[in-house]
């Protein structure tokens, strides 16, 4: 009886694992083995595919074959018993095009209200992704074990920290890789779960802001308790994209080591042009807080984010404020070609009660003022990019008296 050729050959490539699967054509015939040959582009001869000769099952692994993953390859298969079937040719394919990204390796660290995720490619020193290793980005799905409500986080790098979590709570997550340059989306990792720790005695510092004063940077933050010491560290932001090493060498800002106030001042020349990450930690001598959320600090934006200049038109029950571009030393306006948001603080001259208005527009109305009353106004600019979180210093306060009643028109 003539042996039939095997059918429906599937090639599965995940990272550097090359798997072939096929269907037997005739289930009734026992003790059949299967063998594959392969042919490279531009070659006439067929070569035996090592790892896939005389296979008794319907699956084989040819990962040991050292192929050029960018070169087209053709496969053929036949069944063998006493005689052999005719060859069945598989459509030619390029391994790199066909390959899927495997599940990444995931390690988790827990804090009280944060989780640190360390991600690395599932196949170390992969041949398939050798030219693309630096281009991997990752996305994850995270949920509270108790609720199952999922949150997706896209475009993260090999180390990512998720903040604002609850203490003593189990969170689960899964991660997949992507190579956006090749339009490849990978397979999810297994689910990893970790429980956040008990709440730390000392919370981390919050609301970190950098501003420029003279030739110095002024770094400020908020803290819950008094009599603390703080330290500030920096890291080049691009290092977060480096998948190679899991050690981030955060560096101390010398003037911000063991400071006893919730601010520190350091010369602008501490940092060359670039984008940095900053973080702050508190200590009371016995206990240390976890690190604050990291803020992005762009020296280019920071240096030029100057306080806004404004004019006030006074009415009886309101001020109209017109915000203009800040002036440089030569009285020329600074062109700030990124979107800004303005924070305007105003108060009655005889009171400390401040009120705040946040506006994207450059003409702002401050309503509900009393006639014939002196009000003071100061303003500052913020970048609208949440990640960069840049703020200018406040402008000098300008004080004006409202007009007598009935002049609101």
């Amino acid at each position: 009886k003539n042996l039939k050729s095997p059918q429906k050959v599937e090639v599965d490539i995940i990272d550097d694992n090359f798997i072939l699967r096929w269907n037997r054509s005739d289930e009734s015939v026992g003790n059949v083995t299967f063998s594959f040959d392969y042919q490279k582009t531009g070659m006439d001869n067929w070569i035996k595919l090592s790892g896939c000769q005389n296979i008794t099952s319907t699956k084989c692994n040819f990962s040991s074959l050292k192929l050029n993953v960018y070169e087209e390859i053709k496969l053929r298969i036949r069944a063998e018993k006493e005689n052999t079937s005719s060859w069945y040719e598989v459509d030619s394919f390029t391994p790199f095009r066909k390959a899927q990204i495997g599940p990444p390796e995931v390690h988790l660290e827990a804090e009280d209200k944060a989780i640190v995720i360390h991600i690395s490619p599932g196949t170390k020193d992969s041949v398939m992704w050798a030219l693309d290793g630096l281009s991997f980005t990752y996305s994850l799905v995270i949920w509270k074990n108790s609720s199952g409500v999922e949150e997706r986080i896209e475009n993260i790098y090999s180390r990512h920290k998720i903040y604002k979590l609850s203490p003593e709570t189990t969170y689960c997550l899964k991660v997949k890789a992507a190579l956006l340059t090749s339009w490849k989306i990978g397979v999810y990792s297994p689910v990893h779960c970790i429980k956040t720790t008990v709440e730390n005695e000392l919370p981390p510092p919050e609301n970190i802001e950098v501003s420029v004063q003279n030739q110095n940077y002024v770094l400020k933050w908020d803290y819950t308790y008094a009599n603390m010491t703080f330290q500030v560290q920096w890291l080049h932001a691009f290092l977060k994209r480096n998948p190679g090493n899991h050690l981030y060498k955060w560096k101390q800002i010398p003037d911000c080591e063991n400071v006893k106030t919730t601010q520190c001042v350091f010369p602008q020349n501490v940092f060359q042009k670039g984008i940095y990450l900053l973080r702050v930690q508190a200590s009371d001598g016995n206990n240390t807080s976890f690190w604050s959320e990291e803020i992005k600090f762009d020296t280019e934006i920071q240096a030029f984010l100057l306080p806004p200049v404004f004019n006030i038109r006074s009415l009886s029950d309101s001020f109209h404020i017109y915000i203009g571009a800040p002036k440089q030393s030569g009285n020329t306006p600074v062109i700030q070609d990124y979107p800004l948001i303005y924070e305007i603080i105003f108060w009655e001259n005889t009171s400390n009660a401040e009120r705040k208005i946040i506006e994207k527009k450059t003409d702002v109305t401050v309503p509900n003022l009393k006639p014939l009353t002196v009000y003071c106004v100061k303003a500052r600019a913020h970048t609208m990019d949440e990640k960069l979180n840049k703020s200018s210093v406040f402008s000098d306060a300008v004080c004006e008296k409202t007009k007598p009643g009935n002049t609101s028109k």
């Epitope: 660290e109 827990a110 720790t197 005695e201 090493n245 050690l247």
Partner: antibody, heavy 118, light 107 residues
Framework: QVQLVQSGAEVKKPGASVKVSCKAS????????IHWVRQAPGQGLEWMGR????????KYAPKFQGRVTMTADTSISTAYMELSRLRSDDTVVYYC???????????WGQGTLVTVSS | DIQMTQSPSSLSTSVGDRVTITCKTS??????VAWYQQKPGKAPKPLIY???YRYSGVPSRFSGSGSGTDFTLTISSLQPEDFATYYC?????????FGPGTKVDIK
């Protein structure tokens, strides 16, 4: 493969200094921190400090501050730990170890016994 | 400085036994705890990092757990080569510190 090979045993007089070396191979010393840990006979492990060989930034345990100096020569992939004003209780084994972020101290040198005796 | 206590300080046990060593830190260190095994005259051998991850080549009978201030090293079925001293280590904040050690010997 990754290895840290330390210099040989030393005998020193009280008040003298000792400099222990730690030669790294199988990895780029600039990408890691090198830590120093010591152990008295029959006692536990005691952390002394660490150096970032890339820029020579150091952190020392308060107990050794002013008496220990950690340095590195990246051109020969070697870190050094010098301890001055030696006392008899500095008779211990000194270890160097590679620090790899959340992987902690993942590779250790074989140890160097320093004996302080008059 | 973060203080570390380990218990028990020593234990006598037999091959095949399940062994649990605990480590307490004086403040919350997240999961920044590692465990090392040391035999006489040898350098410490890394077993566990980041509380619960085994270094490559470490047998699966070794496991770590815990977080915050309480950590545990478990040897599920003690083997003859496991008789040694075990140290926990915090690498959350400087100065880094080690536990005093737990000596596991033959009953």
């Amino acid at each position: 493969q990754v290895q840290l090979v330390q210099s040989g045993a030393e005998v020193k007089k009280p008040g003298a200094s000792v400099k222990v070396s730690c030669k790294a191979s199988g990895f780029n010393i600039k990408d890691y921190y090198i830590h120093w840990v010591r152990q008295a006979p029959g006692q536990g492990l005691e952390w002394m400090g660490r150096i970032d060989p890339e820029d020579a930034e150091t952190k020392y345990a308060p107990k050794f501050q002013g008496r220990v100096t950690m340095t590195a020569d990246t051109s020969i992939s070697t870190a050094y730990m010098e301890l001055s004003r030696l006392r008899s209780d500095d008779t211990v084994v000194y270890y160097c170890a590679r620090y790899h972020g959340y992987w902690a101290l993942d590779y250790w040198g074989q140890g160097t016994l320093v004996t302080v005796s008059s | 400085d973060i203080q570390m206590t380990q218990s028990p300080s020593s234990l006598s046990t037999s091959v095949g036994d399940r062994v649990t060593i605990t480590c307490k830190t004086s403040q919350n260190v997240g999961t920044n705890v590692a465990w090392y095994q040391q035999k006489p005259g040898k350098a410490p051998k890394p077993l566990i990092y980041s509380t619960s991850y085994r270094y490559s080549g470490v047998p699966s009978r070794f496991s770590g757990s815990g977080s915050g201030t309480d950590f545990t090293l478990t040897i599920s079925s003690l083997q003859p080569e496991d008789f040694a001293t075990y140290y926990c280590h915090q690498y959350f904040s400087y100065p880094y510190t080690f536990g005093p050690g737990t000596k596991v010997d033959i009953k």
